[in-house]
């Protein structure tokens, strides 16, 4: 006869009750809220009332765990999902309800991923509004333009020129360089951070740009810009199906019509619609290359990235990988391929899944040339697939509100207690940094900051010159020896130039997979 181990109790199905429920309707932590559809009573050992089965034990209902991505969490345990914290309570996740930062990206030569997650292809060859808050009747505060050259046809010469107009300033990103073409009126919250493969620009409290020094540009916005932006990046309203809203407020079906509407100058020709299957960017005319590209790009859905695939949809990046790698003029140049895989790995890292995907033969990256002693550098540079993005250095002496958790690339490693002087490329004691201290904060050499901006009585503009601090009242423009400011440059200035040299990459790909 059936005997049960306590605290389980024996249930024998009654022969006279066809609707009785038995072992087949055992309540578990995972099915507790589901109704049972019994196809016939099964006798066996059940948990006593007030308890449910979990793995092979009986547990009190309030001791049931929660589940997230196949992992079990005990009551009271927390997980971070995006920018929200969730606590396990009564078998359910109880989460905070913050609107997270939103990221819009240009990926590769011609793909865009909007703030709301819509991916589309637009191989435009003009200058376009990537994102701005000059939308409808809004009095805007910033505009980011992107100009493409050589990005609409198979080429390794694709270059993007990004123009950032904010706070009266103009900053240009092009060919791996940052040019401050006009300083911002208030540089208090302006920082240029070089970190690994990336350059991160902090452009105020709610706007930042992350650039891989080549074709990948991400604009990160805080919640304050929700539903206030427009351009190729969409409108950050949480809804994907209105992301292709043109500059004249039409929701377009075709990304080409949408993209053309955000052109800065009407003198630049509209992009024409080309059926994708006849585009050279799908390798349709080169079966050998197509097979090679397909199998290489599959790394994105292979075991290497399997943990990340559960969190970040690889499909947009797979499309970009195939398009861009096919677009590269020769199979030997895998920069297009490597950049796309790196872009996906970067997003994975931001979601807490660090993937070490580079190998000695697949897009290798070394930092050894930065460790050459004859360069006189006194800190060790090491490759890291996920190192803190905005570290404290002499040039950034205070912790920064970094838009990304970590970045890959070559990073300086200093002995404990020392920090990097980026200028001298050496590790120094923090007190040896050329900084100015004011109001309990440390400012890097060259920084111009506004103190007490909302208090006209005490408002000051302070300038840290190496270690000498000079301050002046906000309303008095005198003080520093500055020549007259040049006339503002029109943001719509078109550039036309012959770019003949191939883009630079600090890694190579010895072969595709």
């Amino acid at each position: 006869s059936l005997s049960c181990r306590p605290p389980m109790v024996k249930l024998v199905c009654p022969a006279d009750n066809l609707r009785a429920e038995g072992l087949e309707c055992t309540k578990t932590c995972q099915n507790y809220d589901l109704e049972c559809m019994s196809m016939g009573c099964v006798s066996g050992c059940l948990c006593p009332p007030g308890m449910v089965r979990h793995e092979n034990r009986c547990v009190a209902l309030e001791r049931c765990p929660c589940f997230h991505q196949g992992k079990e969490y005990a009551p009271g345990e927390t997980v971070k999902i995006g920018c929200n914290t969730c606590v396990c309570q009564d078998r359910k996740w109880n989460c905070t309800d913050h609107v997270c930062d939103a990221t819009c990206s240009t990926i590769g030569m011609a793909h865009y991923l909007t703030f709301d997650g819509l991916k589309y292809l637009f191989p435009g060859e003009c200058q376009y509004v990537l994102v701005q808050d000059y939308c409808g009747s809004n009095p805007g505060t910033f505009r980011i333009l992107v100009g493409n050259k050589g990005c609409s046809h198979p080429s390794v010469k694709c270059k993007k020129r990004v123009t950032i107009l904010v706070e009266g300033g103009e900053i240009e990103l092009f060919d791996g360089e940052v040019n401050v073409k006009r300083p911002m009126k208030d540089e208090t919250h302006f920082e240029v951070v070089e970190s690994g493969r990336y350059i991160i620009l902090l452009l105020g409290k709610a706007l930042s740009v992350v650039w891989d020094r080549h074709l990948s540009i991400s604009v990160v916005l805080k919640q304050t810009y929700q539903e206030k932006v427009c351009g190729l990046c969409g409108n950050f309203d949480g809804i994907q199906n209105n992301d292709l809203t043109s500059s004249n407020l039409q929701v377009e079906e075709d990304p080409v019509d949408f993209g053309n509407s955000w052109k800065v100058s009407s003198q630049c020709a509209d992009t024409r619609k080309v059926p994708l299957d006849s585009s050279p960017a799908t390798c349709h005319n080169n079966i050998m290359k197509q097979t090679m590209v397909d199998s290489s790009c599959r790394i994105l859905t292979s075991d290497v990235f399997q943990d990340c695939n559960k969190l970040v949809d690889p499909e947009p990046y797979l499309d970009v990988c195939i398009y861009d790698t096919c677009s590269c003029e020769s199979i030997g140049d895998c920069a297009c391929f490597c950049d796309t895989i790196a872009a996906y790995a970067h997003v994975c890292a931001q979601h807490g899944k660090v993937v070490t995907w580079r190998t000695a033969t697949l897009c290798p990256q070394s930092c050894e040339e930065r460790n050459l002693r004859e360069n006189g550098y006194e800190c060790e540079w090491r490759y890291n697939s996920c190192a803190p993005a905005c570290q404290v250095t002499c040039q950034h002496p205070e912790p920064l509100a970094c838009p990304v958790q970590c970045v890959e690339g070559c990073h300086a490693h200093c002995p404990p207690g020392k920090i990097l002087d980026e200028l001298l490329q050496t590790c120094v004691d923090p007190e040896d940094c050329p900084v100015c201290e004011v109001a309990g904060r440390r400012f890097a050499s060259g920084k111009k900051v506004t103190l007490n901006p909302s208090d006209p009585e005490h408002c000051q503009i302070c300038h840290c010159d190496v270690v000498n601090l000079t301050c002046e009242a906000c309303q008095e423009p005198g003080g520093l020896v500055v020549p007259p400011t040049d006339a503002p440059v029109s943001p719509t200035t078109l550039y036309v130039e012959d770019i003949s040299e191939p883009p630079l990459h600090d890694f190579y790909c010895s072969r595709l997979l």
Epitope: E170, G176, E177, V178, N179, V180, K181, R182, P183, V192, V193, E194, I199, R213, Q395, E422, L423, L424, Q425, P434, A444, S445, G446, K447, H463, C464, D465, V466, L480, V481, V482, P483, P484, T485, D486
Partner: nanobody, 128 residues
Framework: QVQLVQSGGGLVQAGDSLRLSCAAS????????MAWFRQAPGKEREFVAA????????YYADSVKGRFTISRDNAKNTVYLQMNSLKPEDTAVYSC?????????????????????WGQGTQVTVSS
Amino acid sequence: QVQLVQSGGGLVQAGDSLRLSCAASGRTFIRYAMAWFRQAPGKEREFVAAIPQSGGRSYYADSVKGRFTISRDNAKNTVYLQMNSLKPEDTAVYSCAATSTYYGRSAYSSHSGGYDYWGQGTQVTVSS
């Protein structure tokens, strides 16, 4: 604070070369990014070239790329502008400028408002 004293300049023929120097006072020269600007009569001040504190790479206006070279000697507290294949349109007053702002190894400012200290200016005239 730094004082900048310029030398060089003068009258040359088209196709000739000329070198401008800009000497800085003070012991912290290495902490300053340096640049050259020029202003032709009746025109706005124009960016010519810049070299960051680290001196690793330099930046040029399209109009002088391949002809002009900016360099610095931190031991001598001096920045130079070597001008080759000079053209009549290079005629201007050339000024060196300094800022202690460090934007990074791959960043610079091409705007005069990004610089805090200026040399006295030196005339370069290129005749055809």
